[in-house]
Structures are given as C-alpha cells and as structure tokens.
C-alpha cells in the first residue's frame, strides 16, 4: 500500500508508470507544503478504489496528466 498516515508525506513508494486515463476515478495533485516538501500525485482507480502514488517527475506521468486535463477540457462546456 503506497499510503501512510504515520509520515508527513502521504506516499511511501511512487511509480513512474502511467495508468490508463479511462480507469481513473480521481487524480489528486497535492502541492508541496510544510508537512511534505514534495508534490504528490495520488491516483484512485475505478476498480476496487485502489490508490496509487505516481512520480510527478516521470515523463510518462506528465503525459498522463496532460491526457487527463485534455479529457476534462473536452467534457467541460
């Protein structure tokens, strides 16, 4: 499980690998703060509601964010 309440940052392990945008329930981008010095990206999957931490520095994850924002802009009027 990549999440923990016992450390200041939410993510313990992060993945460089993208996921299929269509399988995402939610994508949270948590900015760096006094509690955690790095940006964290948490993907909640539609299947089983599983949460995954994604590496914001990974090119593949940046591509995923681009794809998701493009999808959102298509949907919004």
């Amino acid at each position: 499980v990549p999440l923990s309440r016992t450390v200041r940052c939410t993510c313990i392990s992060i993945s460089n690998q993208p996921v299929n945008p269509r399988s995402l329930e939610k994508l949270e981008i948590i900015p760096a703060s006094q509690f955690c010095p790095r940006v964290e990206i948490i993907a909640t999957m539609k299947k089983k509601g599983e949460k995954r931490c994604l590496n914001p520095e990974s090119k593949a994850i940046k591509n995923l964010l681009k794809a998701v924002s493009k999808e959102r802009s298509k949907r919004s009027p």
Epitope: S15, N16, Q17, P18, V19, K59, A60, N63, A67
Partner: antibody, heavy 119, light 107 residues
Framework: EVQLVQSGAEVKKPGATVKISCKVS????????MHWVRQAPGKGLKWMGW????????TYADDFKGRFTFTLDTSTSTAYMELSSLRSEDTAVYYC????????????WGQGTTVTVSS | DIQMTQSPSSLSASVGDRVTITCKAD??????IAWYQQKPGKAPKLLLH???TLQPGIPSRFSGSGSGRDYTFTISSLQPEDIATYYC?????????FGQGTKLEIK
C-alpha cells in the same frame, strides 16, 4: 545486461489465435511499462499499446482494440501479447519494447516475433 | 493522436556524405522525439532521445536538433554500416507515434 527475448516465429490459419511471449532479464520487470509494436512486411513501425507491469492493466491504441490482449506473468518476468480471430493482414513482426517511463521513450527492444497468417 | 510526417521516404547517398532526415509533428512535441535505426531482419535500435541526446555507444556522427514541431536527424559522414531504415518517435503523449521511416541506401 538488459534483454527482452521473444518467442519464435508462428504460422497460423485465419481465425486461429496466437500468443507471443517476451521474457525479460537484467532488470526488475515491474519497474518499467512494456509496450508492443507491429511491423507489417515492408512497412513502418506502429505502436499497439502498453501494459503497466505493476498492476497488469493494459491500454490499447485505437487500431488494436478488440482482438488484442496484453497480459503478464510477473513470477517469470514475462509479458504476453495474444491475438485472436487472425486475419491475413495480421501477418507481421511483433516487437515488445521496454519503456524507460521516467524519460518516456523505448530504450530496449525484443528481437521480434514473425507471425504469418495463411490458409 | 499526434501525427509525425517523416521525409524523405528513401534516400540514396555516398559514403562520406552528410545525410539529413526530417520529422514534422502536427503539434508542438516539446523536443520529446527519439530516433531509431533498423537494419533488415533486426529490431529497432535507439540512437538519440530528447531530440539530441546520444545513447551510450552510438557514434558521434549521429546527431539531432529541432524544437516545436520540426526536427532533424543528421549523419555527418555516412558510413557503409549506416545503411538502414531510420524512424522518429514522438513521446510527448500517452499515445506514441512513429514517423513513416526513411530507407537509406548507398549510391
């Protein structure tokens, strides 16, 4: 040494199913996504999609939705590509390619598997 | 999907010639282009990524440049072993696309 070793050439009849394997060595299998690329005889390279090796979740390019299935066996560090209801136009060389996700490009390729569909 | 238009589709040159291949994307790909060499019966081999970064072990006669939508791959002095087909790949999107390829022959 990082290696992707694919299964041997296949000759199949139209309507049959083929399953190609891509066994990796020299790195941790679940650290990199695995992509598949098709090359028809005398033609260029066409990206087919990828599988997330941590979750097993496949993603298919639009032209490769329906008859194509990407799967994994993480215990043997092997990726598979299965193609059903074979047609003559599926005759091609199929490559697996590791994506160096952090930077985003394909850095290591399998040697290719030739699939020939002929009645 | 991002479309990549590669030209020329074939090219004949002499040993020692400077050879240039171009790829044009239909939108800005932010320098996220790689170049591959494929010899007959072999898998593609990565030469350059991020427009101009040479892979370890690749001779310095291979180079790349460009930005925005327009990219160039150059062999400064063609060698007999460079006879192959060359492909560009854009990876600025989750949906990858290759150029159509350029077949390079010796005159």
């Amino acid at each position: 040494e990082v290696q992707l070793v694919q299964s041997g050439a296949e000759v199949k009849k139209p309507g049959a199913t083929v399953k190609i394997s891509c066994k990796v060595s020299g790195y941790t299998f679940t650290d990199y996504s695995m992509h598949w690329v098709r090359q028809a005889p005398g033609k260029g390279l066409k990206w087919m999609g990828w599988i997330n090796t941590e979750t097993g979740e496949p993603t298919y390019a639009d032209d490769f939705k329906g008859r194509f299935t990407f799967t994994l066996d993480t215990s043997t560090s092997t990726a598979y590509m299965e193609l059903s209801s074979l047609r003559s136009e599926d005759t091609a060389v199929y490559y697996c390619a590791r994506n160096y996700d952090y930077d985003g490009y394909f850095d290591v390729w399998g040697q290719g598997t030739t699939v020939t569909v002929s009645s | 999907d991002i479309q990549m238009t590669q030209s020329p589709s074939s090219l004949s040159a002499s040993v020692g010639d400077r050879v240039t291949i171009t790829c044009k994307a239909d939108q800005d790909i932010n320098k996220y282009i790689a170049w591959y060499q494929q010899k007959p019966g072999k898998a593609p081999k990565l030469l350059l990524h991020h427009t101009s970064t040479l892979q370890p072990g690749i001779p310095s006669r291979f180079s790349g440049s460009g930005s925005g939508r327009d990219y160039t791959f150059t062999i400064s002095s063609l060698q007999p072993e460079d006879i192959a087909t060359y492909y560009c790949l854009q990876y600025d999107s989750l949906l990858f696309t290759f150029g159509q390829g350029t077949k390079l022959e010796i005159k």
